[in-house]
């Protein structure tokens, strides 16, 4: 799991787009709201993001949906979908 | 599973270039992007530059305008053309390989290649 530390000045991404794959894991952490990375999972897939990064993804995902993902963001989960277990898959409501 | 062997590096003055190739062998369908990495003496593993499966290229700040990232899609190689050369770029280079599919999905990597810059 990746340390809480505070967002360097300036680091704060405005929207998910291919500058973060530079960001380090606790820098994605720190710097990448939650709900915008919700609102723009349709850009994820077309970012090549490395495996320890879309670790770090999901588990801001997790953290905001602790209940199971909603279906807006399940529909674009793309190669985040190799994140999930058979534990996250049950807590989903798709219908 | 997946294979990538680098080769290229080398001692190499200040201000020269060098060009490092990136070979991928065994599960190659379904590479969605390569790149490099460099470790430099007491640093950690950073990005230098990645291209993707349809040829979209990226770069580190510090690189930009030297460095230029290429993938040859028939013979599963990526390249990395270094120009002007500085000693900071003295580090391992590393290639990497996303796989994005099953079986094996992940991230792989070379063994690396030694860059060095000096005079």
């Known amino acids: 799991e990746v340390e809480k530390t505070a967002c360097p000045s300036g680091k704060k991404a405005p929207e998910i787009d291919e500058s973060l794959i530079f960001y380090k894991k606790w820098e994605l952490e720190a710097c990448v709201d939650a709900a915008l990375l919700a609102t723009q999972m349709d850009r994820v897939n077309a970012i090549p993001f490395t495996y320890e990064q879309l670790d770090v993804l999901k588990h801001k995902l997790d953290e905001l949906y602790p209940q199971g993902y909603p279906e807006s963001v399940i529909q674009h989960l793309g190669y985040l979908f190799l994140k999930m277990s058979p534990e996250d898959i049950r807590k989903w409501n798709v219908t | 599973q997946l294979q990538l062997v680098e080769s290229g590096g080398g001692l190499v003055q200040p201000g020269g270039s060098l060009r490092l190739s990136c070979a991928a062998s065994?599960?190659?369908?379904?590479?969605?992007?390569m790149g490099w990495y460099r470790q430099g003496p007491g640093n950690e593993r950073e990005l230098v530059a990645v291209?993707?499966?349809?040829?979209?290229?990226s770069y580190a700040d510090s690189v930009k305008g030297r460095f230029a990232i290429s993938m040859d899609n028939d013979k599963h190689t990526v390249y990395l053309q270094m120009d002007s050369l500085k000693p900071e770029d003295t580090a391992v280079y590393y290639c990497?390989?996303?796989?994005?599919?099953?079986?094996?999905?992940?991230?792989?990597w070379g063994q690396g290649t030694q860059v060095t810059v000096s005079s």
């Open positions: 065994g599960s190659v369908n379904s590479i969605t992007a």
């Open positions: 990497n390989a996303h796989r994005r599919t099953w079986p094996h999905p992940g991230d792989y």
């Open positions: 291209i993707t499966d349809r040829g979209r290229a």
